[in-house]
């Protein structure tokens, strides 16, 4: 499709033509103040230097002002998430100004050309903000730029170019190609606003990473490790194999960042929490469910600005759809002994019973091999609020059913033909809730019977000695 003004150079050429031959200049970046929740409403187009539309459309100088910045597009038309985000912002912040930054003419290009256009779009936003700052009562501190994909880097440029410091930039899965590893002035970075929070939902360490992998904000949140999002697998999005393509999976995972942000706006009573961790594997092991020293935070709109944090990587698990919130638990299981285990890797399953609800049977993901005579840490999460935990049912199986494991099991059996039965000895389970930060210890129901064979179950109840309960220092976020 045609580029009316393309990168900065072309725009400059166009503007410096002699008046006589200057073509009609249509702005390639438009600012639409969404004055109504009604999608049919045309809104108000703001124009640099023209104060009348601000007055006519009731621009509130003292209120929060959101600028929503879309990304690269393969269609010349807004994508559906935009309506959801605008609507959610209007619902949550009734007096706020919600401005859609429409740069479709410059975004509906080859990706490389759209990337080259991000700077000029960022500059346009900065100029608009500089002009607004000349008005009485308008404060840059009340400005929140929300950029999706390529739009996140546009927001970065805007924050970099503006006179002063923007209050907040939220990067929703900032684009990866041509930005990964780039200099801080050529991508979104913590210097671009007073607070920069980022959601990463489509990062890949192999193949093309649509979203940027590196941390680029004050806090960088990686839901589900920042890669495979629940509900976005091929089976989930295709409905039936006759319909859809891999493109739908990409869209689902990349766009998930937007929906997580929308969720944080509309489901205020169901906030999702993320936990600081050095990497995804450690988080999967359940090591990082601490709220001490600002190590946890709400995600999305409710995220709290953390002082002195830069590039702080945070992780959480989510549901497949709204509300995305799950309840995280760290489980520490001390395996006292193996009996006749050979080379078999156990796979644990737990069912949690609470005052509000009971969980489904949950597998404990093994990130590293189970250690004997050692405490093994796992992460489990439930979609429902179980309330206070009352008891835990534990079972285990010999191996996950891969050909390699089946071969190991067969080899183990052949080496011990008189295998008298494999057993594990587990006496207690220590549990910590990520959301409440409460710690509990669960003891085997029958202290004399703590051995468990594959397929059998072992029950654990809260230990009698004051439940061995501890509370960590109060988290800095408002936990429910």
């Amino acid at each position: 499709s045609p580029t009316p003004f393309g990168p900065e150079g072309q725009l400059a050429d166009e503007l410096h033509k002699p008046k006589a031959i200057q073509t009609e200049v249509k702005p390639s970046v438009r600012f639409n103040l969404r004055t109504s929740k009604d999608p049919e409403h045309e809104g108000c187009y703001l124009s640099l230097g023209h104060s009348q539309p601000l007055e006519d459309c009731g621009f509130n100088m003292t209120a929060k002002t959101f600028f929503i910045i879309h990304g690269w597009t393969m269609s010349g038309i807004f994508e559906n998430w935009l309506h959801k985000l605008v609507s959610a912002l209007h619902t949550r912040e009734k007096d706020a100004n919600v401005v859609v930054v429409d740069w479709l003419p410059l975004a509906h290009q080859l990706y490389t050309d759209a990337v080259n256009n991000t700077r000029v779009v960022g500059h346009s936003i900065a100029r608009m903000l500089d002009w607004l700052q000349e008005k009485d009562d308008f404060s840059l501190g009340n400005v929140h730029l929300i950029g999706y994909s390529l739009g996140a880097h546009v927001a970065g440029y805007a924050g970099n170019f503006v006179k002063g410091t923007v209050g907040r930039i939220t990067g929703l899965d900032p684009a990866g190609p041509m930005f990964e590893g780039a200099d801080i002035h050529k991508r979104l970075s913590p210097d671009d606003a007073d607070f920069v929070d980022v959601l990463h939902t489509y990062t890949r360490s192999f193949g093309l990473s649509i979203g940027i992998q590196m941390p680029v904000g004050h806090i960088d949140i990686y839901p589900n490790g920042g890669d495979f999002q629940p509900g976005c697998g091929l089976n989930d999005v295709l409905g039936s194999m006759a319909y859809g393509t891999i493109t739908e999976v990409v869209k689902c995972e990349h766009e998930r960042a937007v929906h997580l942000f929308v969720d944080s706006l509309v489901n205020q009573d169901k906030p999702s929490f993320a936990f600081q961790c050095t990497d995804s594997n450690r988080f999967k092991k359940g090591i990082c469910l601490s709220c001490r020293k600002n190590r946890c935070n709400s995600i999305g709109y409710n995220a709290k600005k953390m002082r002195n944090k830069r590039n702080s990587k945070m992780y959480l698990k989510t549901r497949a759809g709204m509300p995305f919130r799950v309840y995280h638990y760290q489980m520490k299981i001390h395996v006292f002994s193996y009996k006749n285990m050979g080379e078999i890797e156990p796979t644990f399953y737990v069912t949690l019973y609470g005052t509000n609800a009971d969980s489904q049977t949950l597998p404990l993901e093994i990130v590293e091999r189970i250690e004997q005579n050692a405490t093994n840490t796992f992460l489990v999460y439930t979609e429902e609020d179980l309330g206070d935990l009352l008891k835990i049912q534990l079972t285990w199986e010999g191996a996950s059913q891969s050909w390699y494991n089946l071969w190991k099991e067969l080899r183990s059996y052949l080496s011990q033909p008189h295998n008298p039965g494999r057993e594990l000895n587990i006496r207690r389970i220590r549990v910590k809730s990520g959301e409440t930060q409460r710690k509990l210890t669960f003891c085997a129901e029958d202290p004399e019977n703590t051995s468990i064979s594959p397929g059998r179950e072992l029950w654990f109840r809260k230990c009698r000695d004051g439940w061995r309960m501890k509370n960590e220092t109060s988290p800095t976020v408002e936990l429910p």
Partner: antibody
């Protein structure tokens, strides 16, 4: 009030092309997307594609991508849909429809243009 | 593409009664669902947008509900002019798709 007025009925031979026009009035033409939807006799409605009249950006249904071209003339506030390599199964009523700001729902429709493809 | 299914091809209801029409999406479309009414020889008419938002000029007896994959159009008290074909349409992702329609006929 918003009005979309389409060109008249067409009879075409297989392999030919047809170009249907849709003149908009009662609103700012460049502020809203324009979409084309067709309906074969007794069939469901089928979205063919849309255009952003502000700068001419288009998106098409893959099913028609190689055969359909949507254009606009902003000075005349008119959108066009051209369908080439016509076959008998393209016999249908073709509608233009004005999208909302986000292009999702269609509150205003043209009266429809009947295109008959017959040898 | 997202497949929209209107399970009832025809629904027979008496005037004055309530009519409930359903529409199912093959995957989650949140609230990006719109309902149209079409009478013979006429263009479709938008009744409900974004699952539940009413349209200016459309009688209050028309209401919509649902989210995700299951949606419902309810006509609280059928009038003679309501007997027509009703289509649902999703705008969650390209290509936009319509259901096959439900014909509402007089019982």
């Amino acid at each position: 009030q918003v009005q979309l007025v389409q060109s008249g009925a067409e009879v075409k031979k297989p392999g030919a092309s047809v170009k249907v026009s849709c003149k908009a009035s009662g609103y700012t033409f460049t502020d809203y997307t324009m979409h084309w939807v067709r309906q074969a006799p007794g069939q469901r409605l089928e979205w063919m594609g849309g255009i952003n009249p502000y700068y001419g950006g288009t998106t098409y249904n893959e099913k028609f991508k190689d055969r359909v071209t949507i254009t606009r003339d902003t000075s005349a506030s008119t959108a066009y849909m051209e369908l080439s390599s016509l076959r008998s199964e393209d016999t249908a009523v073709y509608y233009c429809a004005k999208g909302d700001y986000y292009g999702g729902s269609y509150n205003y429709w043209g009266q429809g243009t009947t295109v008959t493809v017959s040898s | 593409e997202i497949v929209m299914t209107q399970s009832l091809a025809t629904l027979s209801v008496s005037p004055g009664e309530r009519a409930t029409l359903s529409c199912r999406a093959s995957q989650d479309i949140s609230n990006s669902l719109h309902w149209y009414q079409q009478k013979p020889g006429q263009a479709p008419r938008l009744l409900i947008k974004y699952a539940s938002q009413s349209i200016s000029g459309i009688p209050a007896r028309f209401s919509g509900s649902g989210s995700g994959t299951e949606f419902t159009l309810t006509i609280s008290s059928l009038q003679s002019e309501d007997f027509a074909v009703y289509y649902c349409q999703q705008s969650n992702s390209w290509p936009y798709t319509f259901g096959q329609g439900t014909k509402l006929e007089i019982k």
